[in-house]
């Protein structure tokens, strides 16, 4: 009996692999170990087939490799003898999306595995609060995202649709701004951006607190709590306190959870260490002056959430100061 005459046919397997733009990925392929191993990874589009990586006669063969894959692919050469034909793919680009076939031939069989590669990107979005003249706006912004995300807004937990969307990047990655006019409103707002491919969701929440009326020389406590519903215990986050003045934001304090470092840019600003340990980032501003009147913004941000809390502080002259005038 000539064993070489008996060849096993294995139907084409298909796997979907999801990678991130700029990162590395492994396209998996395995086979029943055997001698005389030949591996051909190819990329298939509607019209052509492109050589991605080949291996035969005991070494990688890149003479006919398509230039777009140069220095970006390799096999696990030490693992081939164990049946591993997986491709290590470096620095993914959106153009790498598509169908890859891995042909593996040995002395006794040939198989073809199909891998569908999808590439996504989701740079952490931001929620910004802006004042333009007498108008107030909330902007949800994602600098780089692919594929197009689903963006939803809620006002007091009720979905709303009236927002202004701007998009750049015709083929992707996209840069998207979604703007909501919230002039005169003291409702809470929530913006959610979802990348369905990467199964990643980011939520920005904006809350306007009741206005605080204080007298000159007094101190004020501005509340800002990290809500456990939003943040998991081991998640890194940052807290920024800033002041909005004539549409310009100036930072007052900054805290980084990963290093537990706090930086103050205003000497009259402080927070209670005890409260901070309980994820309460409420601030004290002492020795108030008339010029301290305005909007104070607390921003707690992680990869998945941004919580914006706005306080409006009105500082009024004390009686002594009033009678001096």
């Amino acid at each position: 009996i000539f064993l070489s005459a008996f060849f096993t046919y294995v139907p084409m397997n298909e796997q979907i692999i999801i990678g991130r733009l700029g990162e590395d990925i492994i396209l998996p392929s395995s086979f029943e170990r055997g001698s005389e191993v030949v591996i051909h990874w190819k990329y298939q589009d509607s019209y052509n087939s492109y050589n991605v990586h080949s291996y035969y006669k005991g070494s990688g063969r890149l003479e006919s490799q398509d230039t777009r894959y140069a220095n970006r692919t390799s096999l696990f050469y030490n693992e081939i003898q164990n049946g591993n034909a997986s491709l290590f793919f470096r620095r993914l680009s959106l153009l790498d999306e598509g169908i890859y076939t891995c042909y593996v031939g040995t002395a006794i069989q040939a198989i073809t595995n199909k891998v569908v590669l999808k590439v996504g990107v989701f740079l952490t979005p931001m929620m910004k609060y802006e004042k333009r003249n007498t108008n107030s706006f909330l902007i949800c912004n994602v600098l780089s995202v692919y594929p197009r995300p689903i963006i939803t807004w809620k006002m007091d937990n009720t979905p709303i649709s009236e927002n202004n969307m701007q998009e750049t990047g015709s083929l992707g990655p996209f840069s998207i701004n979604s703007t909501l006019n919230i002039t005169g409103s003291n409702s809470s707002y929530e913006c959610t951006i979802e990348n369905s491919l990467l199964k990643q969701t980011w939520t920005g929440r904006w809350t306007m607190k009741d206005g605080l009326h204080k007298m000159q020389s007094e101190h004020v406590s501005l509340s800002c709590e990290l809500v456990n519903d939003y943040f998991s215990p081991n998640q890194d986050f940052k807290v920024t306190w800033s002041r909005m003045e004539s549409g310009i934001s100036s930072i007052l304090a900054y805290y980084l959870s990963s290093s537990q470092n706090t930086t103050f840019y205003e000497s009259r600003f402080s927070w209670n260490k005890e409260l901070k340990n309980q994820s309460d980032f409420s601030m004290n501003l002492t020795d108030l002056s008339l010029s301290d009147s305005g909007e104070y913004l607390c921003n707690i941000s992680s990869d998945e959430y941004t919580l914006l809390t706005i306080h409006t502080v009105h500082v009024e002259p004390s009686q002594e100061t009033a009678s001096d005038n």
Epitope: A5, F7, E36, V38, K42, S49, R61, S64, G105, A110
Partner: antibody, heavy 121, light 106 residues
């Protein structure tokens, strides 16, 4: 079992063309590279051309480059050799041979019985 | 192009003899060498690949050795069925055959 059957040979005048075919059975045709090898009467073997499993690559011996074209139709499980500008020195038995796998290895566990091409005026 | 030179061109031997055929490459071909047996009017038959690997179904009296540029095919004990022409083939770079060695009965 693997079977390769060549056809299309015959007598042809110098400068004319001929097309050889090789019908395959007994294996998954689209998984294997295929070669043409020839043997002039009373002489040794000469490799002519190879085409890879998916038709993506083809290579030729210098003696036939630019005159012969190897092709395949995976749906018909057939291999072809289009021979143009034939010369007397192309007279030979033409064998269809299957590569060990994709075509990249270049040796032949399976052969057809051959078809004779005679180039003569 | 890589040239393959076989020696001898003709070899006379008797049943039971141990015979050796040599094949020399014009440049190193690592171990990418195959040996074939061909009988008159028939297609060649693969005996050895990768210089020393025995193709399945081929009797163990056939063996191959060598690497680089020098290779040998050995038949340890000639059988009546072994009288034929033997070809070496390099497949390091495309493919080239040796001119053949005719093994005939003494």
């Amino acid at each position: 079992q693997v079977q390769l059957v060549e056809s299309g040979g015959g007598v042809v005048q110098p400068g004319r063309s001929l097309r050889l075919s090789c019908a395959a059975s007994g294996f998954t045709f689209s998984d294997y590279g295929l070669h043409w090898v020839r043997q002039a009467p009373g002489r040794g073997l000469e490799w002519v051309a190879v085409i890879w499993y998916d038709g993506s690559e083809e290579y030729y011996a210098d003696s036939v480059k630019g005159r012969f074209t190897i092709s395949r139709d995976n749906s018909k499980k057939s291999l072809y050799l289009q021979m143009n500008s034939l010369r007397a020195e192309d007279t030979a038995v033409y064998f269809c041979a299957r590569d060990r796998n994709s075509g990249a290895l270049g040796y032949f566990p399976h052969w057809g019985q051959g078809t004779l091409v005679t180039v003569s005026s | 192009d890589i040239q393959m030179t076989q020696s001898p061109s003709t070899l006379s031997a008797s049943v039971g003899d141990r015979v050796t055929i040599t094949c020399r490459a014009s440049q190193s071909i690592n171990n990418w060498l195959a040996w074939y047996q061909q009988k008159p009017g028939k297609a060649p038959k693969l005996l050895i690949y990768k210089a020393s690997s025995l193709e399945s179904g081929v009797p163990s009296r056939f063996s191959g050795s060598g690497s680089g540029t020098e290779f040998t095919l050995t038949i340890s004990s000639l059988q009546p069925d072994d009288f034929a022409t033997y070809y070496c083939q390099q497949y390091n770079s495309y493919s080239t055959f040796g001119q053949g060695t005719k093994l005939e009965i003494k």
